[in-house]
């Protein structure tokens, strides 16, 4: 589920509309934002989700232990690999799911190595560090709301607020701050 | 000005409102999107702009030749440096301006080296390559429109469409695909 350290802070402008469960099926964005929301699929962290899930269903993913270990990319694999695999601070993508967010599923990058791959030996070196590169992404956050004006949350009723969250998009290899 | 290779493709949903020059001061977002637009300042490529411009005005920026060259990394300089300076695929931020976009100014990352810095020598090595990491950012694109229904653009009149553009957010060091 969602990593709370990556969550942004919501800022409301005016009073957002409070939708009932009937008005808004689970996992759907509010209609007045859907025209804009329809374009969310172009965002890389959203677009990657379907290919990650498809690969997972096809059984293409290696067993978890293999994909979470610091790898050595074989010389012959370098020729055809993607950036996240060819990087000496390699990363994998993990599908992050948050049911109170739209889009509910985002691809988060996770560094596979604590250090970086030494280009001479092909092995991980602690002389360098892999660090995540974060980017902001505008999302909608769903919150319980009151439909009767009482101020008490109406069961199954939600309002939406826009907010920025920090999404890890990849990893870069850095010289450590202290030795 | 804006690098066209990084521009997304607009997708309109319905007919957007056509604003006159009086209704909408130059560089401002449409009022119905401003509540949301007010939060754009939290996006990293937007937030960085003011600090980059402030540094430029204070004369903090080194002369262009120094900031666009691949640096020699010295261990003593690394202790207090930011990720983009400590990276062995270092980058700088450039303010990208596009008057037909909101936000008009965005910070784009530019790799400083074609290769990467060899941690042993502090100097560039061609055995590795610096590549940009791109991320999608939702922006508003301003286009001429007709206010009289004739279909011909009304001078000074604009409609806004949302679109995703690819923004370079940093650089990573990779094994070259082919020699």
């Amino acid at each position: 589920h969602h990593d709370p350290s990556l969550r942004g802070h919501p800022h409301s402008h005016g009073t957002p509309h409070c939708y009932s469960a009937e008005e808004l099926p689970l996992g759907q964005a509010p209609p007045h934002l859907l025209a804009r929301g329809a374009k969310w699929g172009q965002a890389l962290p959203v677009a990657l989700v379907s290919s990650l899930e498809a690969a997972s269903h096809r059984g293409r993913h290696e067993r978890p232990s293999a994909t979470t270990q610091c790898p050595v990319l074989r010389p012959e694999e370098v020729l055809e690999a993607d950036t996240h695999q060819r990087s000496i601070s390699p990363w994998r993508y993990r599908v992050d799911t948050d049911e109170d967010r739209y889009p509910q599923k985002l691809a988060f990058a996770e560094c596979l190595c604590r250090g970086c791959i030494d280009a001479r030996t092909g092995r991980e070196t602690a002389a360098l560090n892999s660090v995540r590169l974060l980017q902001s992404l505008l999302v909608l956050r769903r919150r319980p709301c009151s439909r009767d004006g009482s101020g008490l949350p109406t069961p199954g009723a939600f309002a939406f607020h826009t907010e920025f969250i920090h999404v890890p998009v990849g990893c870069t290899c850095v010289l450590p701050r202290s030795v | 000005h804006h690098d066209p290779s990084l521009r997304g493709h607009p997708h309109s949903h319905g007919t957007p409102h056509c604003y006159s020059a009086e209704e909408l001061p130059l560089g401002q977002a449409p009022p119905h999107l401003l509540a949301r637009g007010a939060k754009w300042g939290q996006a990293l490529p937007v937030a960085l702009v003011s600090s980059l411009e402030a540094a430029s005005h204070r004369g903090r920026h080194e002369r262009p030749s120094a900031t666009t060259q691949c640096p020699v990394l010295r261990p003593e300089e690394v202790l207090e440096a930011d990720t983009h300076q400590r990276s062995i695929s270092p980058w700088r931020y450039r303010v990208d301006t596009d008057e037909d976009r909101y936000p008009q100014k965005l910070a784009f990352a530019e790799c400083l080296c074609r290769g990467c810095i060899d941690a042993r020598t502090g100097r560039e090595t061609a055995a590795l390559n610096s590549v940009r990491l791109l991320q999608s950012l939702l922006v508003l694109r301003r286009r001429p429109c007709s206010r009289d229904g004739s279909g011909l653009p009304t001078p000074g009149a604009f409609a806004f469409h949302t679109e995703f553009i690819h923004v370079p957010v940093g650089c990573t060091c990779v094994l070259p695909r082919s020699v």
Epitope: V78, R120, T121 | A127, R177, V179
Partner: antibody, heavy 120, light 111 residues
């Protein structure tokens, strides 16, 4: 000093087998990918195979795949090439060479070579 | 047939400069400056002279230099000496089929 020394070459009949060895000294052998490269008499250099620093990964040129096997013993600082089903066209001087970047053809240390002759 | 094309032979007089070319494609030599060059005297093992297109290993004379233009890498030897007479090979990464490729070799004769 840094050196590689090959041994095990000789005359063998077509279809026969031979095992080449390469002894390393003067450097941390277990840190390096090593390749076998051959040179037919009067001809150019041809890359044959590599083995990763740990020995877990190997790769072969199409011309020797399925017939040759590369291996190493890091405890003994030694590299091996087991050659089976030898053909006349395998006749060459065989060199072991250290790779200075594991994924690039920068061979910075070479052995003196050992001659393999395949003839009936 | 080699994927990298070198002239079969070049010659020069002592003190002169000569250049040996190594022509590949946009996907090998043309992509990055990563060609390496080897010197081989008769009956001896090859010796690395240039790597990363233009870098010299320690112990190699600065009379040897490497460069690249388009899809062609070049080795230049200035102030030619008798001991430079040898075969010279360029090398590049190839494909999954032949991972590392060498040029056909160039015989340098010092007149």
């Amino acid at each position: 000093q840094v050196q590689l020394v090959e041994s095990g070459g000789g005359l063998v009949k077509p279809g026969g087998s031979l095992r080449l060895s390469c002894a390393a000294s003067g450097f941390t052998f277990s840190d390096h990918y090593i390749s076998w490269i051959r040179q037919a008499p009067g001809k150019g250099l041809e890359w044959v195979s590599y083995i990763s620093s740990s020995g877990s990964t190997t790769y072969y040129a199409e011309s020797v795949k399925g017939r040759f096997t590369i291996s190493r013993d890091n405890a003994k600082n030694s590299l091996y090439l087991q050659m089976n089903s030898l053909r006349a066209e395998d006749t060459a001087v065989y060199y072991c060479a250290r790779q200075s970047y594991y994924f690039l053809p920068y061979f910075d240390v070479w052995g003196q070579g050992t001659l393999v002759t395949v003839s009936s | 047939q080699s994927a990298l094309t070198q002239p079969a032979s070049v010659s020069g007089s002592p003190g002169q400069s000569i250049t040996i070319s190594c022509t590949g494609t946009s996907s090998d030599v043309g992509s990055y400056n990563l060609v390496s060059w080897y010197q081989q005297h008769p009956g001896k093992a090859p010796k690395l002279m240039i790597y990363e297109g233009s870098k010299r290993p320690s112990g190699v004379s600065n009379r040897f230099s490497g460069s690249k233009s388009g899809n062609t890498a070049s080795l230049t030897i200035s102030g030619l000496q008798a001991e430079d007479e040898a075969d010279y090979y360029c090398a590049s990464r190839g494909s999954r089929r032949v991972l590392y490729v060498f040029g056909g070799g160039t015989k340098l004769t010092v007149l």
